[in-house]
């Protein structure tokens, strides 16, 4: 089942998704879509990166972290109730059926009548505590012409990491880190 995240109407929502590039600049394509991940790619794409840069985005959706270091967490600006639903983060690791996909459920709550004086944004994040690590042998490795030869070797979880104090006071989340290389 999807991991659930919460935000209030009018605030920014944060959906975590991470991978670790094999080397600086060795980026992999990532897409974010509204709706669960389909068999390939993303449905209703709101943002995507390629091997170099963010190459497609729609209004209100952006990457606040350093995507060049693998932080492809999605920020949705000024959310409304219509932003509720499932979002897909797909990390398109080159090779044979190597994609990692995460379905994240965003729940938008009505704004509080009396806003709290200190903590104005309520984000909860509870990524799965354990993700499966897959072995990769020669049969599952593909050398690419223009892309780096990248293997997925480790998946780890980050728990309650304090992130991005500019986005919100005491914003805490846990995300999935995919280590490549």
């Amino acid at each position: 089942s999807e991991v659930e995240y919460r935000a209030e109407v009018g605030q920014n929502a944060y959906l975590p998704c991470f991978y670790t590039p094999a080397a600086p600049g060795n980026l992999v394509p990532v897409c974010w879509g509204k709706g669960a991940c389909p068999v390939f790619e993303c449905g209703n794409v709101v943002l995507r990166t390629d091997e170099r840069d963010v190459n497609y985005w729609t209004s209100r959706y952006w990457l606040n972290g350093d995507f060049r270091k693998g932080d492809v967490s999605l920020t949705i600006e000024n959310v409304t109730l219509a932003d509720s639903g499932i979002y897909c983060c797909r990390i398109q690791i080159p090779g044979i059926m190597n994609d990692e996909k995460f379905n994240l459920k965003l729940v938008i709550k009505p704004a509080k009548v009396t806003p709290a004086p200190t903590r104005q944004r309520d984000f909860t994040a509870a990524f799965p505590r354990m993700l499966t690590t897959r072995g990769h042998g020669p049969a599952e490795t593909q050398t690419l012409g223009s892309l780096p030869d990248i293997n997925l070797t480790q998946i780890s979880t980050l728990a309650n990491e304090l992130r991005d104090s500019r986005l919100a006071n005491d914003l805490r989340d846990s995300g999935a880190t995919i280590r490549i290389g």
Epitope: P29, V39, Y56, I93, P94, G95, I96
Partner: antibody, heavy 121, light 107 residues
Framework: EVMLMESGGGLVKLGGSLKLSCAAS????????MSWVRQTPEKRLEWVAT????????YYPDSVKDRFTISRDNAKNTLYLQMSSLNSEDTAVYYC??????????????WGQGTSVTVSS | SIVMTQTPKFMSTSVGDRVSVTCKAS??????VAWYQQKPGQSPKPLIY???TRHTGVPARFTGSGSGTDFTLTISNVQSEDLAEYFC?????????FGAGTKLELK
Amino acid sequence: EVMLMESGGGLVKLGGSLKLSCAASGFTFSSYYMSWVRQTPEKRLEWVATISNSGGSTYYPDSVKDRFTISRDNAKNTLYLQMSSLNSEDTAVYYCARDPYYTNYVPMDYWGQGTSVTVSS
Amino acid sequence: SIVMTQTPKFMSTSVGDRVSVTCKASQYVDTYVAWYQQKPGQSPKPLIYSASTRHTGVPARFTGSGSGTDFTLTISNVQSEDLAEYFCAQYSSSPLTFGAGTKLELK
């Protein structure tokens, strides 16, 4: 006009190999995922393989995963399917198809006319 | 893998009729369902994606509906050129799978 033209089909012996090609024109080939789909003599459609626009990612069902290889040459606007260890269940018409993905993944919005592969014992 | 059970296998109709073909997925597939039309001797032609969105150029008499596990393709005011075989497909999870087809014939 979008055109997909398959070639390379024919009669092949059990356990043999064959390489199919699909020449694409009328669109920016490197901006689309591409797939192979086959249709059995009983008219059932079966997905065979898909490749990302750059060629970096490939996808297969278990039935062909270790025997078939999808590849592409974006400079030549051509899609390939290398098939080995062929058996009677691989007898089918093989279609190549285009998969838009950039703003919304949509499966197979254009199909070629197909090329027939018959595996004989 | 997800099985797409398509019914009926054959359907007899007359020009002007309204007909419906159904597909039932063995697991939840959201709205990741497409419909294809195949005329004899031709390759499949896409009609519908995302369960209900018509491809460019597809006449409005073709309507897709459903979500989750149950999906329907409806052809209102059937025309003679609609006599063909129709296939559903799910693209929610790997492997992408097709229904067995429904052949639309004239009475």
